[in-house]
């Protein structure tokens, strides 16, 4: 689900509104591109990215990509338009306020990606299953 509703285009710019119809400011995201990381085998990690950036376009959301191979671990933090694939994957969770990592199939490495739509939400990346809404027990709690 793509979070904001694009209402109209002015001068090739998208005017984006939130669920209440208020005009949405562009997102603030951590934006360090690719950096080496020490985040490994943890339920959640901080990005350790000191750069907070306004996204170029109002429809963009925050993205984090965690990759591990035989040589190193990296964490990528960027803004990205959820209508466009990133690393060949669709940003399925762009409406989420939290950056909940999901594993993607990439040969030769372990690859996790998350996206989210609250300010600086890609600063705290969450791997723990307890946050994953595909967990039926959590869904039960949510709908009770």
């Amino acid at each position: 689900t793509i979070p904001p509703h694009v209402q109209k285009s002015v001068n090739n710019d998208m005017i984006v509104t939130d669920n209440n119809g208020a005009v949405k400011f562009p997102q603030l995201c951590k934006f360090c591109d690719v950096r080496f990381s020490t985040c490994d085998n943890q339920k959640s990690c901080m990005s350790n990215c000191s750069i907070t950036s306004i996204c170029e376009k109002p429809q963009e959301v925050c993205v984090a990509v965690w990759r591990k191979n035989d040589e190193n671990i990296t964490l990528e933090t960027v803004c990205h338009d959820p209508k466009l694939p990133y690393h060949d994957f669709i940003l399925e969770d762009a409406a989420s306020p939290k950056c909940i990592m999901k594993e993607k199939k990439k040969p030769g490495e372990t690859f996790f990606m998350c996206s989210c739509s609250s300010d600086e939400c890609n600063d705290n990346i969450i791997f723990s299953e307890e946050y994953n809404t595909s967990n039926p027990d959590l869904l039960l709690v949510i709908f009770q």
Epitope: N11, N12, D13, P26, S53, I54, C55, E56, K57, P58
Partner: nanobody, 111 residues
Framework: QVQLQESGGGLVQAGGSLRLSCAAS????????VAWYRQPPGKQREGVAH???????IYADSVKGRFTISRDNSKNTVYLEMNSLKPEDTAVYYC??????WGQGTQVTVS
């Protein structure tokens, strides 16, 4: 080296006006989205006004009709015209542009 430098803040009475400037060096603001944010004392940073590179402007509901964001590309500067100021507009005002550029801020106090 990229620098954004705000100026124009100060002490003003309620109902008064100020014009903030954000002068850039090391970056061409005409090709960038630029926004003004503010941080009121003891509160979170909040978006005030946004100007896209395509010319579209966005304003926070709290300042709509009172504040105007504009650009002078020849001076590589963005402005925030603030009219009918209220005490709740008291804050440090920052300009920002992608990717991750922020000014040091300018204090606006409305008495």
């Amino acid at each position: 080296q990229v620098q954004l430098q705000e100026s124009g803040g100060g002490l003003v009475q309620a109902g008064g006006s100020l014009r903030l400037s954000c002068a850039a060096s090391g970056i061409d603001l005409s090709t960038k989205s630029v926004a003004w944010y503010r941080q009121p004392p003891g509160k979170q940073r909040e978006g005030v006004a946004h100007s896209s590179s395509g010319g579209t402007t966005i304003y926070a509901d709290s300042v709509k009709g009172r504040f105007t964001i504009s650009r002078d590309n020849s001076k590589n500067t963005v402005y925030l015209e603030m009219n009918s100021l209220k005490p709740e507009d008291t804050a440090v005002y920052y300009c920002t542009a992608p990717v991750g550029y922020w000014g040091q801020g300018t204090q606006v106090t409305v008495s």
